[in-house]
């Protein structure tokens, strides 16, 4: 029927989003290059660089990684976007000055075990949760 | 002992972070105003504004909300920061050109129920997960 056809068009069209976004994502730059889509980046963190070498015994550092990149319309499946992020992306297209894009944040985090001195100089082995980024997504 | 005193200083000092950050966070501006800390902002989303009025029967819209604000050093308890975000904040202080600040993202999301027409014009009631931001944090 005409109404269901109109609904289909409405679904596909999502207002002006598609055309707007093609331009919008093409003009999102970081340092004059196209800023890549939200993804995990490798990052090794040295505890000495953080000034923690006097109380952390081991490890000397770890692969923490971090998330960075654009969460631009359309959000692909590999961007692990929540329903809210999908809605926010569309709202941002309509009101870019007022509502930010969703941000690229960790979706999976792992723990690491750390051997350290406590305040009384006791040696402690402790598992620290949410230390390593395993995966990123648009949130 | 001297070594435990040094460890305590090291914990407090986090290399240059402490002094740097006091200034750095005081000078984080967005368009010449101080950008507020990461928090939940109210946002009502109208399905008509998204062009979805022809297939969503009810509700007409909903309070989606969104997260925005700075995740600057030091990350306070109310920022719901992960251990990784705390580490990343310190790394950003040392490497601002290369490692971004953690981002302000939803930490609690709620579902909403939506009554809509499917592709065959059947009326469906479906619960959509992760549609409403309840709380935000630095990730």
């Amino acid at each position: 029927s005409a109404s269901s056809r109109r609904r289909q068009q409405s679904r596909n069209r999502s207002t002006q989003s598609q055309d707007v976004a093609r331009v919008s994502s093409a003009s999102d730059y970081n340092s004059s290059e196209l800023k890549t889509a939200c993804r995990k980046h490798e990052l090794y963190v040295s505890f000495q660089d953080l000034g923690w070498q006097d109380w952390i015994i081991a490890p000397k550092g770890y692969a923490a990684n971090y998330c960075d990149g654009e969460c631009s319309f359309p959000l692909n499946a590999h961007m692990n976007a929540t329903n809210h992020a999908i809605v926010q992306t569309l709202v941002h297209l309509m009101n870019p000055e007022y509502v930010p894009k969703p941000c690229c944040a960790p979706t999976k985090l792992n723990a690491i075990s750390v051997l350290y001195f406590d305040d009384n100089s006791n040696v402690i082995l402790k598992k620290y949760r949410n230390m390593v980024v395993r995966a990123c997504g648009c949130h | 002992s001297a070594s435990s005193r040094r460890r305590q200083q090291s914990r407090n000092r986090s290399t240059q972070s402490q002094d740097v950050a006091r200034v750095s966070s005081a000078s984080d501006y967005n368009s010449s105003e101080l950008k507020t800390a990461c928090r939940k902002h109210e946002l009502y989303v109208s399905f008509q504004d998204l062009g979805w009025q022809d297939w969503i029967i009810a509700p007409k819209g909903y309070a989606a909300n969104y997260c925005d604000g700075e995740c600057s050093f030091p990350l306070n308890a109310h920022m719901n920061a992960t251990n990784h975000a705390i580490v990343q904040t310190l790394v950003h202080l040392m490497n601002p050109e290369y490692v971004p600040k953690p981002c302000c993202a939803p930490t609690k999301l709620n579902a909403i129920s939506v009554l809509y027409f499917d592709d065959n014009s059947n009326v469906i009631l479906k619960k959509y997960r992760n549609m409403v931001v309840r709380a935000c944090g630095c990730h």
């Epitope: 040295s46 000495q48 660089d49 550092g61 | 290399t15 240059q16 000078s27 601002p96």
Partner: antibody, heavy 117, light 108 residues
């Protein structure tokens, strides 16, 4: 007071090598990231490289990547820049600078590197 | 990379006058991560301002920085004889870090 003294500059032929050194004093060297910045004659400043406290994090400008190597010896309070495959466009005064959260709060007087045949 | 363009190239002023130096970025500088340095012939650069508006230790209060986004300004409220030098801006919010070409403040 904080002091940074560069050495090792001089005249070298294109394709040649030089090793610059920077001796630090007046502060705890092992608490700071360090950097090399250069200035070609009559031109502006150009960032070359920086190194973290432990030496585990290092970044280079694209113009020197693969040719220059930054290193440090915290026991000797020293920063180094090994420059290989030198080109005429590498001619500049090379400054060693102490880095604090992205900016440079103390600089040495510089050492001149001239690459010419 | 972010290109920093300083203007004017040369500023001819007398002691006691106010100097206003501009630094324009080709893209927005994140978190106002911009510094200003002073350089005299044959000398090392000296840090004046960081974070766009925070004065470095020991810098007189006649030096002030302002701006955000792509437009930044260094103001010297009353020029002293020792202020005649080259001034350079530097962004450290995006890789690679970059510097402006400098503005020379000379005695009129």
């Amino acid at each position: 007071q904080v002091q940074l003294v560069e050495s090792g500059g001089g005249l070298v032929r294109p394709g040649g090598s030089l090793r610059l050194s920077c001796a630090a004093s007046g502060f705890t060297f092992s608490d700071y990231y360090m950097s090399w910045i250069r200035q070609a004659p009559g031109k502006g400043l150009e960032w070359v490289s920086y190194i973290s406290i432990s030496g585990s994090t290092i970044y280079y400008a694209d113009s020197v990547k693969g040719r220059f190597t930054i290193s440090r010896d915290n026991a000797r309070d020293s920063l180094y820049l090994q420059m290989n495959s030198l080109r005429a466009e590498d001619t500049a005064v090379y400054y060693c600078a102490r880095r604090t959260s992205g900016w440079y709060d103390f600089w040495g007087q510089g050492t001149l590197v001239t690459v010419s045949s | 990379e972010i290109v920093l363009t300083q203007s004017p190239g040369t500023l001819s002023l007398s002691p006691g006058e106010r100097a206003t130096l501009s630094c324009r970025a080709s893209q927005s500088v994140s978190y106002r991560y911009l510094a200003w340095y002073q350089q005299k012939p044959g000398q090392a650069p000296r840090l004046l301002i960081y974070g766009a508006s925070s004065r470095a230790t020991g810098i007189p209060d006649r030096f002030s920085g302002s701006g955000s986004g792509t437009d930044f300004t260094l103001t010297i409220s009353r020029l002293e004889p020792e202020d005649f030098a080259v001034y350079c801006c530097h962004q450290y919010g995006s890789s690679p870090p970059t510097f402006g070409q400098g503005t020379k403040v000379e005695i009129k």
